[in-house]
């Protein structure tokens, strides 16, 4: 799995989409988990409705919501009021029994609001990021991160 980068502005909402094969994952609940660094475990943040047929209903855990279009094959996660501590690695998962398949690896980056002139020590501006060489950009705002590439912001 390559990692897809989604960038959002502090204080605003960010939508993360995870496409999947609707037939292959038919009947499976989905989840959104946060990885403790690249090597660490993935801790569940929120999962879709216990009844798969009701997966379209939005479920919240704090400021994070999840909803699943099981016919179209798109899992959508909304991070509301994005904060610096929301940045990091996440996974969209498809659940079956006690197992979880990774649908997409996601890196969430939190950008400083250019209109907010308060202290932005925990944030970074797009211009500060090292460019991805050969990166595939899917602006939503998102892009794929290839092995060895690092969107390295000096301040985070």
């Amino acid at each position: 799995h390559n990692t897809t980068v989604f960038q959002g502005v502090a204080g605003q909402s960010l939508q993360v989409s995870c496409p999947y094969d609707s037939m292959k994952h038919w009947g499976r609940r989905k989840a959104w988990c946060r990885q403790l660094g690249e090597k660490g475990p993935c801790q569940r943040v929120v999962s879709t409705h216990n009844l798969w047929l009701l997966s379209f209903l939005r479920r919240w855990n704090g400021s994070t919501a999840i909803t699943d279009d099981t016919l179209g094959g798109t899992l959508t996660i909304t991070l509301r009021n994005l904060q610096p501590h929301d940045a990091g690695l996440y996974q969209c998962q498809s659940l079956h029994g006690s197992e979880a398949d990774t649908l997409r690896k996601v890196l969430v980056e939190v950008l400083a609001d250019p209109l907010d002139h308060r202290d932005a020590g925990d944030l970074w501006f797009p211009g500060e990021s090292e460019s991805f060489e050969d990166a595939h950009v899917e602006h939503s705002i998102s892009r794929s991160l290839l092995e060895g590439e690092i969107p390295f912001p000096p301040t985070s």
């Epitope: 403790l36 660094g37 690249e38 475990p41 690695l89 925990d122 969107p151 390295f152 985070s156």
Partner: antibody
């Protein structure tokens, strides 16, 4: 910018304990692993363990499990290492370090080191 | 524990020469996520260590391109194409794939 500021040198007696700090700034403290490394005079680097401030998950080098205790205080963005039952073998410089980025766990940011001297 | 063996212990070079440091692990250091967490650090006297290379061959931000890392399996190499005075110090390889993570014993790069 990212900074790790370690507490000052310690001169302690054998059998005593010491708690050193690593105060961080310039980034969301909860989001990155903090690692502790030991270096005795004239010797190499030794990995002691690491801790994830966002969840208190930690890993230890078995050789330090009874010696070192890693903790964090998220309210002050500070990591701590407590060393107990000190002997002359514990005389060393201790570094804290932070991984570079979410997709690069290399230790890019280091504290300046805390020198611990165990002596009567 | 994974033992990281560095050779040579000491490497005398002339400025402008190429330097090569070898690091061998006692077992493969591929993490369960598929990555090989092999890093190289330089420690100069009185300074904190500095990250040079991560994931075997990726140069860290700001590291001159005369530094390159290579290898796979259990054999890894750090090459410095043209040694400069500021490169002198002790180089350490490090594996961060299997707990406990381990450093090599170090290689001192010194002027011939």
């Amino acid at each position: 910018q990212v900074q790790l500021q370690q507490s000052g040198a310690e001169l302690v007696k054998p059998g005593a304990s010491v708690k050193m700090s690593c105060k961080t700034s310039g980034y969301p403290f909860s989001n990155f692993w903090i690692t502790w490394v030991k270096q005795r005079p004239g010797q190499g680097l030794v990995w002691i363990g690491d801790i994830y401030p966002g969840s208190d998950n930690s890993n230890y080098n078995e050789k330090f499990k009874t010696k070192a205790t890693l903790t964090v205080d998220t309210s002050s963005s500070t990591a701590y290492m407590h060393l107990s039952s000190l002997t002359s073998e514990d005389s060393a410089v201790y570094f804290c370090a932070r991984e570079a980025y979410y997709t690069n766990p290399g230790f890019a940011y280091w504290g300046q080191g805390t020198l611990v001297t165990v002596s009567t | 524990d994974v033992v990281m063996t560095q050779t040579p212990l000491s490497l005398p070079v002339s400025l402008g020469d190429q330097a090569s440091i070898s690091c061998r692990s006692s077992q493969t250091i591929i993490h369960s996520n598929g990555n090989t967490y092999l890093e190289w650090y330089l420690r100069k006297p009185g300074q904190s260590p500095k990250l040079l290379i991560y994931k075997v061959s990726n140069r860290f931000s700001g590291v001159p391109d005369r530094f390159s890392g290579s290898g796979s399996g259990t054999d890894f190499t750090l090459k410095i194409s043209r040694v400069e005075a500021e490169d002198l110090g002790v180089y350490y390889c490090f594996q961060g794939s299997h707990v406990p993570y381990t450093f090599g014993g170090g290689t001192e790069l010194e002027i011939k």
